[in-house]
Interface confidence: medium
């Protein structure tokens, strides 16, 4: 429904606090290098303007679109050209091209300093001195580092962040109370950002149809008692929400997400029996809870799929009448029966079914042609099952750190051109699939593992897109969204790769490694491992293990030494020489 003033409409719907927070997130996700104070100033100006429109919707400029208002505001930043270079050219364009231009300049890996956590007392003082600024700064820092973070969900994280400080800054042992909560928020936040990044990549690179197919499969698994019409309605609404958020339309996105949560809770009876607790919560918690809700029980006595999708004489007639609806019904029916399959597997099955119907419905005897279509599914189902079984066995044998190292070696050999920090980050995340999913029973392993791997491989794809260096990565990332994981799994050692020149500096370490956290120390060692493989891609597992064991012993020895720096200098030279000899460099 049309409103005279869109900005007034959203301000009234969302309330001042959420309005300001969402505008801050939007601006920080667009202008990722701007100082905090500049963004706060812009947000305050927009908020004051919105209030004038609430008072009088016919006031000057109140009828302008949000993109026009926000774009005009962003283009007032004085240092745009110096700070952002060619992004400043966006300001010469008209809407909607200007907004598209801003979107294209979002940087998944902005050159920003790592967030260092201050001492607990320092944080508590800052929180008590100015709670509002403290929380705004949190939104700003997360949003600029994660330009596709799901904005309404970031409001939920900020609410939990505030609750943690409110509780723990009064506790007897502030650090013991606060630090685990902040660690949890950090880890959940990274996971949430990566999941949303995949949704946006799906919409932006593969289109609305791909996203809708994903949503049909996931919602059908989650709500197997809901009928197809209901699932279709939810998919349409969810697609609108994510299209808006991925497109920078954060006010509309948050508003529509709230409406969707309201609809779901008002229609629980026809959706899922698992929603009751979620629907008793306040808005932000409610939306989060619904998004994470467990799968409902499957209805008893679901009939065989073959009747409607293989045996029926109307298969080609129904397919011809409305291809996407019929395929949607197939996906819905298959997914609600298979909570044990990953979403990407379900989408591969639907694609196979579609390809078969395209071919067979044009054949002389369609039924004879598609009669065995379900037999084609068997190898598609067995491939991820076997892969997960093998990798979970390896994980249980090695533990997380060594499992990550095995993946580091595997992926560096597949795509050695990729930057070392990206290979380390992606392989560490791939390795986390073990502790995340292998503990689950068989029926939950595949949806956990393969859908998580899709999220992690998307990180590789978006980071690689910024600076493309490998045709193999480009191919796996762009050919098929649902076949990305099988594509990467199928890659063998890159025989065309010319080994990197040996550089002793890469393997020179200093006493500062001793003061690092266990995680940071692991990253240092894993960085060295990637560099070793890039120098000697044909090195055997045994050779690499020997060098890494020597390296671990060297670090442990020198960190115990009285003169650490001298130890690192002298023993380091010996280690480099021994490693070169061991690897035949």
């Amino acid at each position: 429904d049309a409103h005279k003033s869109e900005v007034a409409h959203r301000f009234k719907d969302l309330g001042e606090e959420n309005f300001k927070a969402l505008v801050l997130i939007a601006f920080a996700q667009y202008l990722q290098q701007c100082p905090f104070e500049d963004h706060v100033k812009l947000v305050n100006e927009v908020t004051e303007f919105a209030k004038t429109c609430v008072a009088d919707e016919s006031a000057e400029n109140c009828d302008k679109s949000l993109h026009t208002l926000f774009g005009d505001k962003l283009c007032t930043v004085a240092t745009l050209r110096e700070t952002y270079g060619e992004m400043a050219d966006c300001c010469a364009k008209q809407e909607p091209e200007r907004n598209e231009c801003f979107l294209q300049h979002k940087d998944d890996n902005p050159n920003l300093p790592r967030l260092v956590r201050p001492e607990v007392d320092v944080m508590c003082t800052a929180f008590h001195d100015n709670e509002e600024t403290f929380l705004k700064k949190y939104l700003y820092e997360i949003a600029r580092r994660h330009p596709y973070f799901y904005a309404p969900e970031l409001l939920f994280f900020a609410k939990r962040y505030k609750a943690a400080f409110t509780e723990c800054c009064q506790a007897a042992d502030k650090a013991a109370c606060l630090l685990p909560k902040l660690d949890e928020l950090r880890d959940e936040g990274k996971a949430s950002s990566a999941k949303q990044r995949l949704k946006c990549a799906s919409l932006q690179k593969f289109g609305e149809r791909a996203f809708k197919a994903w949503a049909v499969a996931r919602l059908s698994q989650r709500f197997p008692k809901a009928e197809f019409a209901e699932v279709s309605k939810l998919v349409t609404d969810l697609t609108k929400v994510h299209t808006e958020c991925c497109h920078g339309d954060l006010l509309e996105c948050a508003d529509d997400r709230a409406d969707l949560a309201k609809y779901i809770c008002e229609n629980q009876d026809s959706i899922s029996s698992k929603l009751k607790e979620c629907c008793e919560k306040p808005l932000l918690e409610k939306s989060h809870c619904i998004a994470e809700v467990e799968n409902d029980e499957m209805p008893a006595d679901l009939p065989s799929l073959a009747a409607d999708f293989v045996e029926s004489k109307d298969v080609c007639k129904n397919y011809a009448e409305a291809k996407d609806v019929f395929l949607g019904m197939f996906l819905y029916e298959y997914a609600r029966r298979h909570p044990d399959y990953s979403v990407v597997l379900l989408l591969r099955l639907a694609k196979t079914y579609e390809t078969t119907l395209e071919k067979c419905c044009a054949a002389a005897d369609p039924h004879e042609c598609y009669a065995k279509v379900f037999d084609e599914f068997k190898p598609l189902v067995e491939e991820p099952q076997n892969l997960i079984k093998q990798n979970c066995e390896l994980f249980e044998q090695l533990g997380e750190y060594k499992f990550q190292n095995a993946l580091l070696v595997r992926y560096t050999k597949k795509v050695p051109q990729v930057s070392t920090p990206t290979l380390v980050e992606v392989s560490r995340n791939l390795g986390k699939v073990g502790s995340k999913c292998c503990k689950h029973p068989e029926a939950k392993r595949m949806p956990c593992a393969e859908d998580y791997l899709s999220v992690v491989l998307n990180q590789l794809c978006v980071l690689h897109e910024k600076t493309p260096v490998s045709d193999r990565v480009t191919k796996c990332c762009t050919e098929s969204l649902v076949n990305r994981r099988p594509c990467f799994s199928a890659l063998e050692v890159d025989e065309t790769y010319v080994p990197k020149e040996f550089n002793a500096e890469t393997f020179t370490f200093h006493a500062d490694i001793c003061t690092l956290s266990e995680k940071e120390r692991q990253i240092k060692k894993q960085t060295a491992l990637v560099e070793l493989v890039k120098h000697k891609p044909k090195a055997t597992k045994e050779q690499l293990k020997a060098v890494m064991d020597d390296f671990a012993a060297f670090v442990e020895k020198c960190c115990k030494a009285d003169d650490k720096e001298t130890c690192f200098a002298e023993e380091g030279k010996k280690l480099v020489a021994a490693s070169q000899a061991a690897l035949g460099l």
Partner: nanobody, 126 residues
Framework: EVQLLESGGGLVQPGGSLRLSCAAS????????VAWFRQAPGKGREFVAG????????YYADSVKGRFTISRDNSKNTLYLQMNSLRPEDTAVYYC???????????????????WGQGTLVTVSS
């Protein structure tokens, strides 16, 4: 707004046939998911048959499959239900329902249909 008006009900012997009509106004019927429901005395509304908007994918309740046929005539903006081999348990008030804005998809759930006709009574008795 969609207005729906059913007709064609009446008394028929077991094994007989009837054809119900539902005339729609206010919106083109082919853009709307439409369905027939029925309500027997003292029972809830029960889905009988449905047809998607924009496409002719049809749906039937198991109890009427092979006996009833749903169709529509877009030029007349009318929905039909051809009922053959009628049984006493088919006795009910038959309602026509429309669900615009979600074309292609019909639903077996009465609460998802915002627009309803006033109903036409079908009695199957010897």
């Amino acid at each position: 707004e969609v207005q729906l008006l059913e007709s064609g009900g009446g008394l028929v012997q077991p094994g007989g046939s009837l054809r119900l009509s539902c005339a729609a106004s206010g919106r083109y019927i082919d853009e709307t998911a439409v369905a027939w429901f029925r309500q027997a005395p003292g029972k809830g509304r029960e889905f009988v048959a449905g047809i998607g908007g924009g496409v002719d994918i049809t749906y039937y309740a198991d109890s009427v499959k092979g006996r009833f046929t749903i169709s529509r005539d877009n030029s007349k903006n009318t929905l039909y239900l051809q009922m053959n081999s009628l049984r006493p348990e088919d006795t009910a008030v038959y309602y026509c329902a429309a669900r615009p804005g979600r074309p292609l998809i019909t639903s077996k759930q009465a609460s998802l249909y915002p627009y309803w006709g006033q109903g036409t009574l079908v009695t199957v008795s010897s």
